[in-house]
Protein backbone atom coordinates (compact mmCIF):
# COMPACT_ATOMS: atom_id res chain seq x y z
CA UNK A 1 0.00 0.00 0.00
CA UNK A 2 1.05 3.48 -0.51
CA UNK A 3 1.32 6.31 1.95
CA UNK A 4 -1.12 8.86 1.25
CA UNK A 5 1.32 12.23 0.75
CA UNK A 6 0.76 15.34 -1.01
CA UNK A 7 1.72 16.09 -4.32
CA UNK A 8 4.51 18.17 -5.25
CA UNK A 9 3.97 21.86 -6.11
CA UNK A 10 3.37 21.76 -10.37
CA UNK A 11 3.48 17.83 -10.72
CA UNK A 12 -0.30 17.54 -10.39
CA UNK A 13 -1.27 15.24 -13.59
CA UNK A 14 -3.18 16.82 -16.23
CA UNK A 15 -3.54 13.96 -18.63
CA UNK A 16 -2.01 10.63 -18.47
CA UNK A 17 1.32 10.55 -20.70
CA UNK A 18 4.43 9.34 -20.97
CA UNK A 19 6.51 11.68 -18.59
CA UNK A 20 4.51 9.64 -15.48
CA UNK A 21 7.00 6.93 -16.20
CA UNK A 22 9.01 8.90 -14.25
CA UNK A 23 7.20 9.46 -11.33
CA UNK A 24 7.86 7.83 -8.08
CA UNK A 25 5.27 5.58 -6.88
CA UNK A 26 4.33 8.03 -4.21
CA UNK A 27 4.22 10.70 -6.68
CA UNK A 28 2.11 8.69 -8.73
CA UNK A 29 -0.26 8.04 -6.20
CA UNK A 30 -0.77 11.16 -5.01
CA UNK A 31 -0.45 13.34 -8.49
CA UNK A 32 -2.92 11.28 -10.37
CA UNK A 33 -6.45 11.11 -10.06
CA UNK A 34 -8.27 8.27 -10.61
CA UNK A 35 -11.71 9.74 -12.11
CA UNK A 36 -8.78 10.82 -14.69
CA UNK A 37 -7.31 7.52 -14.87
CA UNK A 38 -10.42 6.05 -15.97
CA UNK A 39 -11.48 8.43 -18.53
CA UNK A 40 -7.96 8.11 -19.89
CA UNK A 41 -7.33 4.35 -19.92
CA UNK A 42 -7.06 3.86 -23.39
CA UNK A 43 -3.55 5.82 -23.02
CA UNK A 44 -2.44 3.54 -20.03
CA UNK A 45 -1.92 0.36 -22.50
CA UNK A 46 0.28 2.71 -25.03
CA UNK A 47 2.59 3.76 -21.68
CA UNK A 48 5.61 1.69 -20.64
CA UNK A 49 4.56 2.04 -17.12
CA UNK A 50 6.94 0.40 -14.75
CA UNK A 51 5.96 -3.19 -12.68
CA UNK A 52 5.79 -0.94 -9.49
CA UNK A 53 3.86 1.45 -11.00
CA UNK A 54 1.20 -0.69 -12.39
CA UNK A 55 0.66 -2.21 -8.76
CA UNK A 56 -0.56 2.25 -8.07
CA UNK A 57 -2.68 1.87 -10.96
CA UNK A 58 -4.39 -0.77 -9.78
CA UNK A 59 -4.78 0.52 -6.87
CA UNK A 60 -6.15 4.07 -7.43
CA UNK A 61 -8.92 1.91 -9.80
CA UNK A 62 -10.00 -0.23 -6.87
CA UNK A 63 -10.41 2.68 -4.46
CA UNK A 64 -12.70 4.52 -7.45
CA UNK A 65 -14.79 1.31 -8.52
CA UNK A 66 -14.64 -0.61 -5.31
CA UNK A 67 -17.86 -3.10 -6.27
CA UNK A 68 -15.73 -4.03 -9.98
CA UNK A 69 -14.38 -2.12 -13.27
CA UNK A 70 -16.40 -0.39 -15.82
CA UNK A 71 -16.02 -2.28 -18.90
CA UNK A 72 -14.61 1.29 -20.30
CA UNK A 73 -11.73 0.46 -18.08
CA UNK A 74 -11.67 -2.97 -18.05
CA UNK A 75 -11.52 -3.00 -22.00
CA UNK A 76 -8.10 -1.07 -21.94
CA UNK A 77 -6.10 -2.85 -19.10
CA UNK A 78 -3.70 -4.13 -21.05
CA UNK A 79 -0.80 -5.54 -19.09
CA UNK A 80 -2.56 -4.20 -15.64
CA UNK A 81 -5.07 -7.35 -15.92
CA UNK A 82 -2.22 -9.41 -15.64
CA UNK A 83 -2.46 -7.56 -12.21
CA UNK A 84 -5.69 -8.40 -11.34
CA UNK A 85 -6.76 -11.85 -9.30
CA UNK A 86 -9.68 -13.99 -9.84
CA UNK A 87 -11.55 -12.15 -7.49
CA UNK A 88 -11.51 -8.84 -8.66
CA UNK A 89 -12.28 -10.42 -12.00
CA UNK A 90 -15.45 -11.85 -10.62
CA UNK A 91 -16.77 -8.59 -9.77
CA UNK A 92 -16.22 -7.56 -13.47
CA UNK A 93 -19.47 -7.47 -16.12
CA UNK A 94 -17.85 -8.05 -19.47
CA UNK A 95 -20.20 -8.14 -22.24
CA UNK A 96 -18.55 -7.38 -24.85
CA UNK A 97 -16.64 -9.57 -27.03
CA UNK A 98 -13.87 -6.92 -28.15
CA UNK A 99 -13.62 -6.40 -24.79
CA UNK A 100 -12.66 -10.12 -23.92
CA UNK A 101 -10.88 -10.03 -27.13
CA UNK A 102 -8.36 -7.46 -25.99
CA UNK A 103 -7.91 -9.19 -22.52
CA UNK A 104 -7.03 -12.89 -24.07
CA UNK A 105 -4.72 -10.41 -26.54
CA UNK A 106 -2.58 -9.77 -23.27
CA UNK A 107 -2.03 -13.70 -22.34
CA UNK A 108 -1.58 -14.81 -25.97
CA UNK A 109 0.76 -17.45 -26.00
CA UNK A 110 0.81 -18.45 -22.43
CA UNK A 111 -1.35 -20.92 -21.14
CA UNK A 112 -5.14 -20.40 -19.65
CA UNK A 113 -4.32 -18.76 -16.51
CA UNK A 114 -6.86 -18.65 -13.30
CA UNK A 115 -7.73 -14.78 -14.06
CA UNK A 116 -8.06 -15.74 -17.90
CA UNK A 117 -10.56 -18.93 -16.33
CA UNK A 118 -12.43 -16.37 -14.37
CA UNK A 119 -13.23 -14.33 -17.09
CA UNK A 120 -14.31 -16.29 -19.72
CA UNK A 121 -16.68 -17.55 -16.96
CA UNK A 122 -18.13 -14.21 -16.35
CA UNK A 123 -18.65 -13.88 -19.75
CA UNK A 124 -20.04 -16.76 -20.94
CA UNK A 125 -22.37 -16.62 -17.68
CA UNK A 126 -23.54 -13.22 -19.12
CA UNK A 127 -23.75 -14.15 -22.48
CA UNK A 128 -26.01 -17.52 -21.47
CA UNK A 129 -24.73 -19.34 -23.60
CA UNK A 130 -21.48 -20.15 -25.53
CA UNK A 131 -22.53 -18.86 -29.02
CA UNK A 132 -20.51 -18.89 -32.31
CA UNK A 133 -18.56 -15.74 -32.19
CA UNK A 134 -17.41 -16.30 -28.54
CA UNK A 135 -16.69 -19.81 -29.53
CA UNK A 136 -14.48 -19.01 -32.29
CA UNK A 137 -12.43 -16.33 -29.93
CA UNK A 138 -12.49 -18.82 -27.36
CA UNK A 139 -10.78 -21.71 -29.30
CA UNK A 140 -8.62 -19.44 -31.31
CA UNK A 141 -6.69 -18.20 -28.32
CA UNK A 142 -7.20 -21.51 -26.72
CA UNK A 143 -7.53 -24.56 -28.62
CA UNK A 144 -8.27 -26.95 -25.95
CA UNK A 145 -11.10 -24.87 -24.70
CA UNK A 146 -13.67 -26.59 -25.33
CA UNK A 147 -12.15 -29.62 -23.59
CA UNK A 148 -11.67 -28.02 -20.02
CA UNK A 149 -15.69 -27.90 -19.84
CA UNK A 150 -17.85 -30.11 -18.37
CA UNK A 151 -20.22 -32.53 -20.21
CA UNK A 152 -22.99 -30.14 -18.26
CA UNK A 153 -21.19 -27.27 -19.12
CA UNK A 154 -21.25 -28.17 -22.63
CA UNK A 155 -24.39 -28.71 -23.00
CA UNK A 156 -25.21 -24.65 -23.15
CA UNK A 157 -23.40 -24.83 -26.44
CA UNK A 158 -25.55 -24.77 -29.61
CA UNK A 159 -25.60 -26.31 -32.41
CA UNK A 160 -24.94 -23.48 -34.81
CA UNK A 161 -21.53 -22.81 -32.33
CA UNK A 162 -20.08 -26.47 -33.45
CA UNK A 163 -19.28 -24.50 -36.65
CA UNK A 164 -16.63 -22.84 -35.21
CA UNK A 165 -14.62 -26.36 -33.63
CA UNK A 166 -11.61 -27.18 -35.81
CA UNK A 167 -10.32 -30.81 -35.19
CA UNK A 168 -7.21 -29.56 -33.32
CA UNK A 169 -9.91 -28.14 -30.59
CA UNK A 170 -11.16 -31.43 -29.59
CA UNK A 171 -7.94 -32.96 -29.03
CA UNK A 172 -8.11 -33.71 -25.28
CA UNK A 173 -11.70 -34.16 -24.86
CA UNK A 174 -13.21 -37.24 -22.81
CA UNK A 175 -15.46 -39.76 -24.50
CA UNK A 176 -18.19 -38.11 -21.41
CA UNK A 177 -17.23 -34.83 -23.94
CA UNK A 178 -17.48 -36.10 -27.23
CA UNK A 179 -20.94 -37.92 -26.43
CA UNK A 180 -22.16 -34.44 -25.55
CA UNK A 181 -20.59 -32.92 -28.34
CA UNK A 182 -21.36 -35.25 -30.98
CA UNK A 183 -25.45 -34.96 -31.25
CA UNK A 184 -25.07 -31.78 -31.93
CA UNK A 185 -22.75 -32.31 -34.76
CA UNK A 186 -24.84 -34.31 -36.29
CA UNK A 187 -27.72 -31.56 -36.35
CA UNK A 188 -25.11 -28.75 -37.18
CA UNK A 189 -24.03 -30.27 -40.22
CA UNK A 190 -27.29 -32.66 -41.06
CA UNK A 191 -27.84 -30.73 -44.45
CA UNK A 192 -24.50 -31.80 -45.91
CA UNK A 193 -23.33 -34.41 -48.13
CA UNK A 194 -22.09 -37.59 -47.53
CA UNK A 195 -18.36 -36.84 -48.36
CA UNK A 196 -18.60 -32.96 -46.72
CA UNK A 197 -20.68 -34.29 -44.05
CA UNK A 198 -17.52 -36.94 -43.08
CA UNK A 199 -14.36 -34.10 -43.31
CA UNK A 200 -16.78 -32.14 -40.82
CA UNK A 201 -18.05 -34.69 -38.22
CA UNK A 202 -14.70 -36.75 -38.10
CA UNK A 203 -13.28 -35.09 -35.32
CA UNK A 204 -16.53 -35.40 -33.06
CA UNK A 205 -16.91 -39.48 -33.99
CA UNK A 206 -15.58 -40.79 -30.64
CA UNK A 207 -19.44 -39.48 -29.52
CA UNK A 208 -21.02 -41.49 -31.92
CA UNK A 209 -23.33 -45.00 -31.37
CA UNK A 210 -23.38 -47.64 -33.38
CA UNK A 211 -25.81 -47.09 -35.49
CA UNK A 212 -24.35 -44.03 -37.01
CA UNK A 213 -20.83 -46.07 -37.54
CA UNK A 214 -23.48 -48.65 -39.57
CA UNK A 215 -24.59 -45.90 -41.55
CA UNK A 216 -21.65 -44.42 -42.34
CA UNK A 217 -19.63 -47.82 -43.23
CA UNK A 218 -22.40 -47.35 -46.30
CA UNK A 219 -21.35 -44.30 -47.40
CA UNK A 220 -17.90 -45.10 -48.83
CA UNK A 221 -16.20 -42.99 -46.31
CA UNK A 222 -12.83 -44.48 -45.71
CA UNK A 223 -11.90 -43.26 -42.25
CA UNK A 224 -8.68 -43.67 -40.70
CA UNK A 225 -7.11 -45.51 -38.45
CA UNK A 226 -6.48 -42.85 -36.03
CA UNK A 227 -10.77 -41.88 -36.11
CA UNK A 228 -11.59 -44.94 -35.56
CA UNK A 229 -9.22 -45.77 -32.05
CA UNK A 230 -10.58 -43.09 -30.94
CA UNK A 231 -14.57 -44.73 -31.36
CA UNK A 232 -16.37 -45.68 -28.05
CA UNK A 233 -15.46 -49.50 -27.35
CA UNK A 234 -19.29 -49.87 -27.17
CA UNK A 235 -19.52 -48.68 -30.66
CA UNK A 236 -17.94 -50.53 -31.93
CA UNK A 237 -18.24 -53.84 -30.71
CA UNK A 238 -21.81 -54.53 -32.76
CA UNK A 239 -20.48 -53.81 -35.64
CA UNK A 240 -19.79 -56.88 -38.06
CA UNK A 241 -16.65 -58.01 -39.78
CA UNK A 242 -18.44 -56.49 -43.47
CA UNK A 243 -18.95 -53.33 -41.34
CA UNK A 244 -15.65 -52.00 -40.63
CA UNK A 245 -14.38 -53.11 -43.64
CA UNK A 246 -16.64 -51.15 -45.46
CA UNK A 247 -15.91 -48.15 -42.72
CA UNK A 248 -12.24 -48.07 -43.16
CA UNK A 249 -11.37 -48.59 -47.06
CA UNK A 250 -8.38 -48.88 -47.52
CA UNK A 251 -7.38 -48.28 -44.28
CA UNK A 252 -8.73 -51.67 -43.05
CA UNK A 253 -5.16 -53.23 -42.95
CA UNK A 254 -3.71 -50.95 -39.81
CA UNK A 255 -5.99 -53.17 -38.05
CA UNK A 256 -3.16 -55.55 -37.44
CA UNK A 257 -0.93 -52.42 -35.89
CA UNK A 258 -3.69 -52.19 -33.78
CA UNK A 259 -4.84 -55.74 -33.11
CA UNK A 260 -3.97 -55.58 -29.29
CA UNK A 261 -5.21 -51.96 -28.20
CA UNK A 262 -9.15 -50.94 -27.91
CA UNK A 263 -11.37 -50.80 -29.21
CA UNK A 264 -9.56 -53.35 -31.82
CA UNK A 265 -8.33 -55.86 -29.22
CA UNK A 266 -12.26 -55.88 -28.03
CA UNK A 267 -13.88 -56.03 -31.13
CA UNK A 268 -11.81 -58.67 -32.32
CA UNK A 269 -12.83 -60.89 -29.36
CA UNK A 270 -16.02 -60.69 -30.60
CA UNK A 271 -15.78 -61.75 -34.14
CA UNK A 272 -16.03 -65.43 -35.18
CA UNK A 273 -12.71 -66.38 -36.62
CA UNK A 274 -14.00 -67.28 -40.12
CA UNK A 275 -15.46 -63.62 -40.81
CA UNK A 276 -11.68 -62.46 -39.68
CA UNK A 277 -9.96 -64.32 -41.95
CA UNK A 278 -11.53 -62.79 -44.77
CA UNK A 279 -9.72 -60.01 -44.48
CA UNK A 280 -6.38 -61.48 -44.68
CA UNK A 281 -4.95 -59.49 -42.22
CA UNK A 282 -3.83 -63.02 -39.92
CA UNK A 283 -6.11 -61.50 -37.16
CA UNK A 284 -6.28 -63.75 -34.70
CA UNK A 285 -8.17 -64.47 -30.86
CA UNK A 286 -11.74 -64.19 -32.68
CA UNK A 287 -14.99 -66.91 -31.51
CA UNK A 288 -13.38 -70.50 -33.21
CA UNK A 289 -15.44 -72.34 -35.68
CA UNK A 290 -18.23 -74.26 -34.12
CA UNK A 291 -19.12 -71.97 -31.04
CA UNK A 292 -21.91 -70.96 -30.13
CA UNK A 293 -22.04 -67.26 -28.53
CA UNK A 294 -24.52 -66.60 -26.12
CA UNK A 295 -25.36 -63.14 -25.47
CA UNK A 296 -25.96 -63.42 -21.43
CA UNK A 297 -27.00 -59.65 -21.24
CA UNK A 298 -30.18 -61.03 -23.28
CA UNK A 299 -30.78 -63.76 -21.13
CA UNK A 300 -30.28 -61.55 -17.86
CA UNK A 301 -33.12 -59.35 -19.22
CA UNK A 302 -35.21 -61.94 -19.94
CA UNK A 303 -35.70 -63.67 -17.03
CA UNK B 1 12.32 -16.45 -16.37
CA UNK B 2 14.63 -13.59 -17.49
CA UNK B 3 18.34 -13.12 -16.76
CA UNK B 4 19.95 -9.51 -16.64
CA UNK B 5 23.94 -9.07 -15.82
CA UNK B 6 24.83 -5.22 -15.86
CA UNK B 7 28.68 -4.32 -16.77
CA UNK B 8 30.35 -1.38 -17.81
CA UNK B 9 30.57 0.36 -14.23
CA UNK B 10 33.37 1.73 -13.06
CA UNK B 11 35.63 5.02 -11.11
CA UNK B 12 35.42 7.92 -13.99
CA UNK B 13 36.26 11.59 -13.52
CA UNK B 14 33.77 14.21 -13.42
CA UNK B 15 32.74 15.25 -17.48
CA UNK B 16 33.81 11.74 -18.38
CA UNK B 17 31.74 9.44 -19.97
CA UNK B 18 30.96 5.29 -19.07
CA UNK B 19 28.57 3.11 -21.25
CA UNK B 20 26.69 0.56 -19.08
CA UNK B 21 25.59 -2.82 -20.77
CA UNK B 22 22.71 -5.16 -19.54
CA UNK B 23 22.73 -8.39 -21.12
CA UNK B 24 19.32 -10.52 -21.01
CA UNK B 25 18.84 -14.16 -21.39
CA UNK B 26 16.14 -16.20 -20.99
CA UNK B 27 12.52 -15.77 -21.90
CA UNK B 28 13.71 -12.49 -23.89
CA UNK B 29 11.50 -12.81 -26.52
CA UNK B 30 8.71 -11.86 -23.75
CA UNK B 31 10.29 -8.73 -23.03
CA UNK B 32 8.47 -5.75 -23.52
CA UNK B 33 10.28 -2.36 -22.25
CA UNK B 34 13.93 -2.45 -20.42
CA UNK B 35 14.34 0.10 -17.52
CA UNK B 36 17.73 1.59 -15.91
CA UNK B 37 17.70 2.55 -12.41
CA UNK B 38 19.73 3.93 -10.33
CA UNK B 39 20.07 4.12 -5.96
CA UNK B 40 22.42 6.55 -4.80
CA UNK B 41 23.61 6.30 -1.17
CA UNK B 42 20.69 7.05 0.89
CA UNK B 43 18.72 8.00 -1.54
CA UNK B 44 15.41 6.09 -2.68
CA UNK B 45 16.09 4.11 -6.53
CA UNK B 46 14.89 6.19 -9.15
CA UNK B 47 14.01 5.30 -12.83
CA UNK B 48 16.70 6.88 -14.93
CA UNK B 49 16.28 5.85 -18.60
CA UNK B 50 13.78 3.09 -20.51
CA UNK B 51 13.51 1.91 -24.05
CA UNK B 52 10.30 -0.09 -24.98
CA UNK B 53 10.50 -3.18 -27.76
CA UNK B 54 8.81 -1.06 -30.77
CA UNK B 55 12.80 1.41 -29.71
CA UNK B 56 11.07 3.92 -28.40
CA UNK B 57 13.12 5.72 -25.13
CA UNK B 58 13.06 8.30 -22.99
CA UNK B 59 14.94 9.63 -19.67
CA UNK B 60 14.85 11.87 -16.99
CA UNK B 61 14.58 14.87 -16.81
CA UNK B 62 17.55 15.31 -15.01
CA UNK B 63 19.97 13.45 -16.98
CA UNK B 64 18.18 14.98 -20.47
CA UNK B 65 21.15 15.80 -22.85
CA UNK B 66 23.85 14.04 -21.02
CA UNK B 67 22.16 10.12 -20.97
CA UNK B 68 20.65 7.79 -23.61
CA UNK B 69 19.42 4.00 -23.96
CA UNK B 70 19.65 2.13 -26.95
CA UNK B 71 19.71 -2.01 -27.63
CA UNK B 72 21.57 -4.26 -29.86
CA UNK B 73 18.03 -6.97 -30.17
CA UNK B 74 19.95 -9.19 -31.86
CA UNK B 75 22.13 -10.20 -28.68
CA UNK B 76 19.99 -9.02 -26.53
CA UNK B 77 21.67 -6.12 -24.92
CA UNK B 78 20.34 -2.64 -24.20
CA UNK B 79 22.85 0.03 -23.38
CA UNK B 80 22.96 3.39 -21.10
CA UNK B 81 25.51 5.63 -22.51
CA UNK B 82 26.26 8.12 -19.93
CA UNK B 83 28.27 11.45 -20.94
CA UNK B 84 29.30 14.72 -19.26
CA UNK B 85 29.02 12.63 -15.56
CA UNK B 86 28.90 14.47 -12.59
CA UNK B 87 29.39 13.44 -8.62
CA UNK B 88 25.54 13.67 -8.32
CA UNK B 89 25.61 10.45 -11.27
CA UNK B 90 27.14 8.24 -8.47
CA UNK B 91 24.86 5.41 -7.74
CA UNK B 92 24.39 1.86 -8.19
CA UNK B 93 22.87 1.17 -11.78
CA UNK B 94 20.19 -1.48 -12.10
CA UNK B 95 18.51 -2.76 -15.22
CA UNK B 96 14.88 -3.97 -15.05
CA UNK B 97 12.13 -5.62 -16.74
CA UNK B 98 8.96 -7.59 -16.34
CA UNK B 99 6.94 -10.00 -18.69
CA UNK B 100 4.22 -11.97 -18.76
CA UNK B 101 4.30 -15.96 -17.15
CA UNK B 102 1.60 -18.14 -16.22
CA UNK B 103 -1.14 -15.21 -15.91
CA UNK B 104 0.29 -12.67 -13.88
CA UNK B 105 3.54 -10.51 -14.48
CA UNK B 106 7.02 -11.37 -13.08
CA UNK B 107 9.87 -8.40 -12.02
CA UNK B 108 13.61 -9.07 -12.66
CA UNK B 109 16.44 -6.98 -11.84
CA UNK B 110 19.95 -7.22 -12.58
CA UNK B 111 22.45 -7.46 -9.73
CA UNK B 112 23.94 -3.79 -10.24
CA UNK B 113 26.79 -1.87 -11.48
CA UNK B 114 28.52 0.89 -9.56
CA UNK B 115 28.98 3.79 -10.85
CA UNK B 116 31.47 6.43 -9.40
CA UNK B 117 32.15 9.85 -10.27
CA UNK B 118 34.99 11.73 -8.84
CA UNK B 119 35.00 15.78 -8.78
Known amino acids: EVEKTACPSGKKAREIDESLIFYKKWELEACVDAALLATQMDRVNAIPFTYEQLDVLKHKLDELYPQGYPESVIQHLGYLFLKMSPEDIRKWNVTSLETLKALLEVNKGHEMSPQVATLIDRFVKGRGQLDKDTLDTLTAFYPGYLCSLSPEELSSVPPSSIWAVRPQDLDTCDPRQLDVLYPKARLAFQNMNGSEYFVKIQSFLGGAPTEDLKALSQQNVSMDLATFMKLRTDAVLPLTVAEVQKLLGPHVEGLKAEERHRPVRDWILRQRQDDLDTLGLGLQGGIPNGYLVLDLSMQEALS | QVQLVESGGGLVQAGGSLRLSCAASGSTSSINTMYWYRQAPGKERELVAFISSGGSTNVRDSVKGRFSVSRDSAKNIVYLQMNSLTPEDTAVYYC?????????????WGQGTQVTVSS
Open chain 2, 96 to 108: NTYIPLRGTLHDY
